[in-house]
């Protein structure tokens, strides 16, 4: 079905990290253009990326309106220069995306260690609470604002002089760990949403080590 000179989009794929979300598809168009529509299960279709020759569409603005909703997108194909043309069934060719629930599926971005501070044999490690593009009352919410206690961080730490790693977990953005006096430690963190079935963990943060500029050391 559809017009003889258009092909339906295929391989519709959601690409999403910390709610920044684009839909990608194939093929690269030849003599055709695309328009994307997005909807919640109960909502109306909203058109985006009108008559584009791209094979991607940024849908962030739509999904951040309610990240717990489930969204469906569809990609319409039109002949270039004749966007009124429809298929044999009276509408243009289109293909549906997989369903996408941002809260459950967006990838967790690589976290950043904001700072660490040693006081005696205790070290306080703070993870940066990254801003997202989700808004409330015209301000951007942080990852913690959005996920609350669903989000935990795992800290990996080890003596600079050895390879044996220890771990700690927190459902805030701070760790307080015990260290050996006089030893330098290195740290890396990972964001985790334990309740998820997919995309549960972020990649590890860049490693930060004591004795470098991020930290503060106070001998008590």
């Amino acid at each position: 079905s559809g017009t003889t000179n258009t092909v339906a989009a295929y391989n519709l794929t959601w690409k999403s990290t910390n709610f920044k979300t684009i839909l990608e598809w194939e093929p690269k168009p030849v003599n055709q253009v695309y328009t994307v529509q997005i909807s919640t299960k109960s909502g109306d279709w909203k058109s985006k990326c009108f008559y584009t020759t791209d094979t991607e569409c940024d849908l962030t603005d739509e999904i951040v309106k309610d990240v717990k909703q489930t969204y469906l997108a569809r990609v319409f194909s039109y002949p270039a220069g004749n966007v009124e043309s429809t298929g044999s069934a009276g509408e243009p060719l289109y293909e549906n995306s997989p369903e996408f629930t941002p809260y459950l599926e967006t990838n967790l971005g690589q976290p950043t260690i904001q700072s660490f501070e040693q006081v005696g044999t205790k070290v306080n490690v703070t993870v940066e609470d990254e801003r997202t593009l989700v808004r409330r009352n015209n301000t951007f919410l942080s990852l913690r604002d959005v996920f609350g206690k669903d989000l935990i961080y795992t800290l990996y730490y080890w003596k600079s002089s050895s390879s044996g790693k220890k771990t700690a977990k927190t459902n805030t953005n701070e760790f307080l760990i015990d260290v050996d006096k006089g030893e330098n430690y290195c740290f890396s963190v990972q964001a985790v949403i334990p309740s998820r079935t997919v995309n549960r963990k972020s990649t590890d943060s860049p490693v930060e080590c004591m004795g470098q500029e991020k930290g503060e050391f106070r001998e008590i």
């Epitope: 690409k15 999403s16 990290t17 910390n18 920044k20 684009i22 253009v33 009108f50 008559y51 584009t52 020759t53 791209d54 991607e56 962030t60 603005d61 270039a80 220069g81 966007v83 971005g109 990254e130 801003r131 997202t132 593009l133 951007f140």
Partner: antibody, heavy 118, light 107 residues
């Protein structure tokens, strides 16, 4: 007001490479698309490519494909544009620009003059 | 790639004149068009996006219109600070493309 601060002017030999940086404020740097646009002396504006830092998605104008690489470092909120196999016609001011809610450019860097000369 | 043809390439006008610049796209780009002003030695400055929406802080003497393939930038009463080069840009599809520019000079 978002300020994009670019690295300083460069003079390069034909055949060499140049890497220009563009530092953005922290915050939502990762989420906004950063494009690179160049302008040869007395000429118009030419889009080279772009990157969405948090997704790692980059694409390039066909003219520059294989010669340009755009990267971003989230930890320093800095985007980079590297252009290789330089020739005299690459002499231009190179701008980084932040794409707004769509793909128009709401904030621009101050520009970096790259001169290619033997 | 979508081509944008701007006309005229240059024009001479006096303070207080009404100035119109046109931009024609090689294919339908809906309203995905922006206008920029550039002064010598400076980066371009966004004036209008979505064909007709004035960027915050831009004087109301600037206006944009059009949809599909034909677009217009109008300066209702030219001011001394408006002498510059103006570019249109389509953001319907990658690669993003610009018009060739229109230089507005003092008569």
């Amino acid at each position: 007001q978002v300020q994009l601060v670019q690295s300083g002017a460069e003079v390069k030999k034909p055949g060499s490479s140049v890497k220009v940086s563009c530092k953005a404020p922290r915050g939502t740097f990762s989420y906004y698309t950063i494009s690179w646009v160049r302008q040869a002396p007395g000429q118009g504006l030419e889009w080279m490519g772009r990157i969405i830092p948090i997704l790692g998605v980059a694409n390039y104008a066909q003219k520059f494909q294989g010669r340009v690489t755009i990267t971003a470092d989230k930890s320093t909120s800095t985007a980079y544009m590297e252009l290789s196999s330089l020739r005299s016609e690459d002499t231009a001011v190179y701008y980084c620009a932040r794409e707004g809610d769509r793909r128009y450019f709401d904030y621009w860097g101050q520009g970096t003059l790259v001169t290619v000369s033997s | 790639a979508i081509q944008l043809t701007q006309s005229p390439s240059s024009l001479s006008a006096s303070v207080g004149d009404r100035v119109t610049i046109t931009c024609r796209a090689s294919q339908d780009i809906s309203s995905a068009l922006a206008w920029y002003q550039q002064k010598p030695g400076k980066a371009p400055k966004l004036l209008i996006y979505d064909a007709s929406i004035l960027e915050s802080g831009v004087p109301s003497r600037f206006s944009g219109s059009g949809s599909g393939t034909d677009f217009t930038l109008t300066i209702s009463s030219l001011q001394p600070e408006d002498f510059a080069t103006y570019y249109c840009q389509q953001f319907n599809s990658y690669p993003l493309t610009f018009g060739g520019g229109t230089k507005v000079e003092i008569k």
